[in-house]
């Protein structure tokens, strides 16, 4: 199994309410195969924000075309940010399995939300 790293370059991102937040994430390898998921928080109560292979996430858009076979950019854009979106977001690589197996997590990016400028 090849060594794989999940890189979240920004430790923190600050966004004004109502704007979009871009959370960056890249992987250093496509192997082992398996999906990327984004979560807010850690542990069993973490919230799924985006799943590469299934689900409907109307406020979340991949930054890069996820259908490219060589895509290793798993950055996402979250629209219409509100104070409720504040928290630390983790980009997590899974290895295929039944169920998929969590392999590597990025270090996390803390999203803070500023008041909407008047």
């Amino acid at each position: 199994e090849e060594e794989l790293q999940v890189i979240q370059p920004e430790k923190s991102v600050s966004v004004a309410a109502g704007e979009s937040a871009t959370l960056n994430c890249t992987a250093t390898s496509l192997i082992p195969v398996g999906p990327i998921q984004w979560f807010r928080g850690v542990g069993p109560g973490r919230e799924l924000i985006y799943h590469q292979k299934e689900g409907h996430f109307p406020r979340v858009t991949p930054v890069s075309d996820p259908t490219k076979r060589n895509n290793m950019d798993f950055s996402i854009r979250i629209s219409n940010i509100t104070p409720a979106d504040a928290g630390t977001y983790y980009c997590v690589k899974f290895r295929k399995g039944s169920p998929d197996v969590e392999l590597k997590s990025g270090a996390g990016t803390e999203l803070s939300v500023r008041a909407k400028p008047s």
Epitope: I31, P35, T67, K68, R95, K96
Partner: antibody, heavy 118, light 107 residues
Framework: DVQLVDSGGGVVRPGESLRLSCAAS????????MSWVRQAPGKGLEWLAG????????YYIDSVKGRFTISRDNSKNSLYLQMNSLTAEDTAVYYC???????????WGLGTLVTVSS | ALTQPASVSANPGETVKITCSGG??????YGWYQQKSPGSAPVTVI????KRPSDIPSRFSGSASGSAATLTITGVRVEDEAVYFC???????????FGAGTTLTVL
């Protein structure tokens, strides 16, 4: 319902060209990667080419690289395969197929027959 | 190259397993495609190793382990008689490949 309708097949002479089309409906075409797969008489399936959802990235099997070109027009919900310098070995039924998130196939066209004969 | 048996046969109601070998587990996803007659459109019965499309009966299931994938039909029916192709996507090469096909005969 997802529908893929292949067209453009026919009888051509060796060395000639042909352009196949695949009309898609029942899903958001611009969100999915697509592929072409063929089946020669009495033979198995052979993947030929794939294209990312946005159309910027293309992938080919070595045997058709340089002769075949996959393309798409998302405004027309259409996929194409331009085939040049055809030989008798290209005689087959050609299918378009929609890709899953991990580049397998979930829906297939009905197929269009290409016959290369002198 | 993907290797699968040329043919299998079973009586109605029996369980059929078709294996497909040749992929590297860490870089490969498998799918299974049913073709009822030559030149007719294939139908996907399994993708992503074990995912069954919503319109495919629950008697079809898939699994992958090591360098092989398996299609299982539990309680096979006469209408399941077809050629089954395994397919694979390799994340190292970005290439799709298919096995030569397995003819399922329901006696």
């Amino acid at each position: 319902d997802v529908q893929l309708v292949d067209s453009g097949g026919g009888v051509v002479r060796p060395g000639e060209s042909l352009r196949l089309s695949c009309a898609a409906s029942g899903f958001t075409f611009s969100s999915y990667a697509m592929s072409w797969v063929r089946q020669a008489p009495g033979k198995g399936l052979e993947w030929l080419a794939g294209i990312s959802a946005g159309g910027s990235d293309t992938y080919y099997i070595d045997s058709v690289k340089g002769r075949f070109t996959i393309s798409r027009d998302n405004s027309k919900n259409s996929l194409y395969l331009q085939m040049n310098s055809l030989t008798a070995e290209d005689t087959a039924v050609y299918y378009c197929a929609r890709e899953t998130w991990n580049h397998l196939f979930d829906y297939w066209g009905l197929g269009t027959l290409v016959t290369v004969s002198s | 190259a993907l290797t699968q048996p040329a043919s299998v046969s079973a009586n109605p109601g029996e369980t059929v397993k078709i294996t497909c070998s040749g992929g590297d587990y860490y870089s490969t996803y498998y799918g299974w495609y049913q073709q009822k007659s030559p030149g007719s459109a294939p139908v996907t019965v399994i993708h992503s190793d074990d995912k069954r499309p919503s319109d495919i009966p629950s008697r079809f299931s898939g699994s992958a382990s090591g360098s092989a994938a398996t299609l299982t039909i539990t309680g096979v029916r006469v209408e399941d008689e077809a050629v089954y192709f395994c397919g694979a996507y390799d994340g190292r090469t970005y290439i799709n490949t298919f096995g030569a096909g397995t003819t399922l005969t329901v006696l």
